[in-house]
């Protein structure tokens, strides 16, 4: 689609005569008829296949034609066409005399023709005007012409349609040859694809407008190169999306189990030493003078029963003091002024003379001790119970009452979390530092294999292209959660993503 433009410049008819040689009365009031048609080696009459146009009266006898002539005419004359310009043409220009105001062909006498010229040849589309002058015996016509494309048409023959746009369907202007020239920030065949923020990750990122970087699910950050940990993750990170790799001191599927209770909670009081002993469990080793699971209780100096031979103990600011019974003396009432004659041995103890009767020694029956067999044996004085266990005297023996999670005569063994068979439906239990883990048989899942899942439809790895597989519990079938760029029940078909 384009326009053949004809610019009339000057017409000379000095004698003011018609083609027949007869003069015009009073002068030749001149107008033009133009016929544009396909190329003919010999231009013949016939339909104006490329179009025709007439002018109003432009002047009398000889005159110059101004651009955009007044009187309703247009100069240059426009002959539009809506086909591919063939590159060749034929042009007929007729000058006519108008005796009256009616310029219609049927209203004019045939002898009103002043002159007729015909040219033909090649003409390329372009902005440059071709200047021409045609002379007959009595007249001369100077004119120029060219072919240009209509708005939105481009190319050598005005056949390429291109309309600049800046909307959802494209962001471009048109080059002279009709090719698209993308606006800044856009690319692709029709300039529909935005150029993302520089550095935006090719797989993990995309954009809907230039200089943007939006992340696909599982990725975060300015350039979408940082993964997002699992939704339930607490104290863990990831190297690929939805992972939960535990920080030091944390365990469990979601890194929510505290393996470093000592550091995170500092449970031991009064300067005690804390030792981690499994998930959420710890042991406090108390400094002298303190007791309790968390060493929270202050010991009295007299609690260790330092006074012997029935001496009574009194707490003092700087320690303790022993009040000795008659016949004894010393810091701990350990020295005696008695002999066997004074029957110093209690609880059935037998007395033996020493140093020629100057002193004695008591041999105590079972369960009694002390210089005079005055004390019941306390088998707990050596703190034999480990891991915070409580020591209890039971007649001639002792026993340890263990804290949860420990067993053995001295609470020395960590109870296996698996001992109570926590895994349901035949699950296999594994003792881990972070707690127990159940390996479930086919058809069961959950932390304790408590969830019936019938069969693991994902066992055969049916999903392609790194899709995530889930078992649909209602149908015992698998469901593939496709990554971006793939569709299909097994994520087997690639697609362009993301659709806008």
């Amino acid at each position: 689609s384009g326009v053949f433009q004809l610019q009339l410049q000057e017409f000379v008819n000095e004698r003011g005569v018609l083609a027949s040689g007869r003069p015009c009365e009073p002068g030749c009031r001149t107008f033009f008829r133009v016929c544009l048609k396909h190329f003919q080696a010999v231009v013949s009459p016939g339909p104006c296949t490329f179009g025709s146009v007439s002018t109003p009266v432009l002047g009398t006898n000889s005159f110059a034609v101004r651009d955009d002539s007044s009187g309703g005419g247009r100069n240059p004359l426009q002959l539009p066409f809506n086909f591919t310009w063939p590159g060749t043409f034929s042009l007929i220009i007729e000058a006519w005399h108008a005796p009256g105001d009616d310029l219609r062909p049927e209203a004019l006498p045939p002898d009103a023709l002043i002159s007729k010229i015909a040219i033909q040849g090649s003409l390329a589309v372009g902005q440059n005007w071709l200047l021409d002058e045609q002379t007959s015996t009595l007249t001369r016509l100077r004119y120029s012409y060219r072919v240009i494309c209509s708005d939105n048409y481009y190319g050598d023959n005005c056949s390429r349609l291109c309309k600049k746009r800046n909307d959802h369907f494209g962001h471009y202007v048109c080059q002279p040859d009709g090719n698209l020239s993308c606006l800044p920030g856009w690319t692709g065949e029709y300039c529909q694809q935005p150029i993302c923020l520089s550095g935006c990750h090719e797989q993990n990122g995309y954009c809907s407008k230039p200089a943007e970087c939006l992340c696909r699910p599982g990725w975060q950050g300015r350039l979408c190169n940082e993964c997002i940990p699992h939704n339930g993750c607490r104290h863990g990170t990831c190297s690929t999306p939805w992972q939960c790799t535990c920080d030091e001191g944390w365990g469990g599927l979601f890194c929510d189990q505290d393996l470093n209770y000592c550091t995170h909670h500092s449970p031991c009081k009064n300067g005690a030493t804390c030792s981690n002993s499994g998930q959420r469990s710890y042991t406090c080793t108390c400094r002298p003078g303190y007791t309790g699971v968390d060493c929270e209780l202050e010991l009295s100096e007299c609690d260790s029963n330092p006074c012997r031979n029935g001496g009574s103990c009194k707490d003092q600011e700087d320690g303790y003091h022993c009040l000795c019974p008659p016949g004894y003396y010393g810091l701990h009432c350990e020295h005696s002024t008695l002999s066997c004659a004074d029957s110093p041995c209690f609880n059935g103890g037998s007395c033996r003379e020493r140093n020629q009767g100057a002193s004695y020694a008591c041999e105590c029956p079972p369960n009694f001790t002390g210089s005079n067999c005055e004390k019941k044996v306390d088998r707990c004085t050596s703190n034999p119970c480990a891991n915070g266990g409580q020591c209890l005297n039971r007649g001639p023996s002792r026993m340890c009452r263990c804290r949860p999670g420990f067993t053995g005569t001295y609470c020395e063994r960590h109870v296996s979390d698996c001992a109570r068979n926590p895994c349901a439906h035949g699950g296999t239990c594994h003792d881990l530092e972070s707690g127990l883990m159940c390996t479930c048989p086919a058809g069961f899942s959950g932390r304790r294999c408590e969830v019936r899942t019938s069969i693991d439809a994902c066992a055969s790895s049916p999903c392609f292209n790194r899709a995530t597989c889930y078992t649909d519990l209602s149908t015992d079938t698998f469901v593939c959660n496709c990554p971006y760029g793939f569709v299909g029940s097994r994520c087997e078909f690639p697609v362009g993503l993301p659709p806008s």
């Epitope: 992340c215 975060q220 939704n231 990170t237 995530t468 993301p498």
Partner: antibody
Framework: EVQLVESGGGLVQPGGSLRLSCAAS????????MAWVRQAPGKGLEWVAT????????NYRDSVKGRFTISRDNAKNSLYLQMNSLRAEDTAVYYC???????????WGQGTLVTVSS | DIQMTQSPSSLSASVGDRVTITCRAS??????LAWYQQKPGKSPKLLIF???VLADGVPSRFSGSGSGTDSTLTISSLQPEDFATYYC?????????FGQGTKLEIK
């Protein structure tokens, strides 16, 4: 236990400013993207803004761009929303949530009410 | 923006009933869909993500399914504590968008 506690809501005049805060605990804050989601009285949920974990890159819904600023202090385990040029249509309960624009919001705070009225 | 349309907007049911709520996206969202439960005066709680994966601590009576543009939340046997408003959310496309909500009331 994951806990998100919002504060800073209140009554403000149109054109005014407000700064919301969210104190996070129970998870390693710096690893996780965070978001603000709002709910106008009697209406549904509407995403407002998100910020990534360590590089702190923000994204906003179109209606708040240029007026709201989301930020975080990973050392203090805190998330913030600076709201300027407030309008009546910004009136809502604002929730702090753990999540991103391309992931579910796994944990939510109790919300703080922002009322914009003259 | 992607439009998320929930149906029904409200629904009455009794304890023990099986209930289904549907969410339709204005275009394919590739299973990137979550469901939330919200009780009056409380914050939303994540129930299901990736269309069918149960969030930690959510009872197994809740389940999700769907593909393409249509997704469904099913509660197999309603309990008294399940009466609330439920929202769906897509997170495939930016910005993330929520459904208008479905209010589940006691009959």
């Amino acid at each position: 236990e994951v806990q998100l506690v919002e504060s800073g809501g209140g009554l403000v005049q149109p054109g005014g400013s407000l700064r919301l805060s969210c104190a996070a605990s129970g998870f390693t804050f710096r690893y996780f993207p965070m978001a603000w989601v709002r709910q106008a009285p009697g209406k549904g949920l509407e995403w407002v803004a998100t910020i990534s974990g360590s590089d702190e890159w923000p994204n906003y819904r179109d209606s708040v761009k240029g007026r709201f600023t989301i930020s975080r202090d990973n050392a203090k385990n805190s998330l913030y929303l600076q709201m300027n040029s407030l309008r009546a249509e910004d009136t809502a309960v604002y929730y702090c949530a753990r999540g991103y624009y391309n992931s579910p919001f796994a944990f939510w705070g109790q919300g703080t009410l922002v009322t914009v009225s003259s | 923006d992607i439009q998320m349309t929930q149906s029904p907007s409200s629904l009455s049911a009794s304890v023990g009933d099986r209930v289904t709520i549907t969410c339709r996206a204005s275009q394919e969202i590739y299973r990137n869909l979550a469901w939330y439960q919200q009780k009056p005066g409380k914050s939303p709680k994540l129930l299901i993500f990736d269309t069918s994966v149960l969030a930690d601590g959510v009872p197994s009576r809740f389940s999700g399914s769907g593909s393409g543009t249509d997704s469904t939340l099913t509660i197999s046997s309603l309990q008294p504590e399940d009466f609330a408003t439920y929202y769906c959310q897509q997170y495939t496309y930016y910005p993330p968008t929520f459904g208008q909500g479905t209010k589940l009331e006691i009959k």
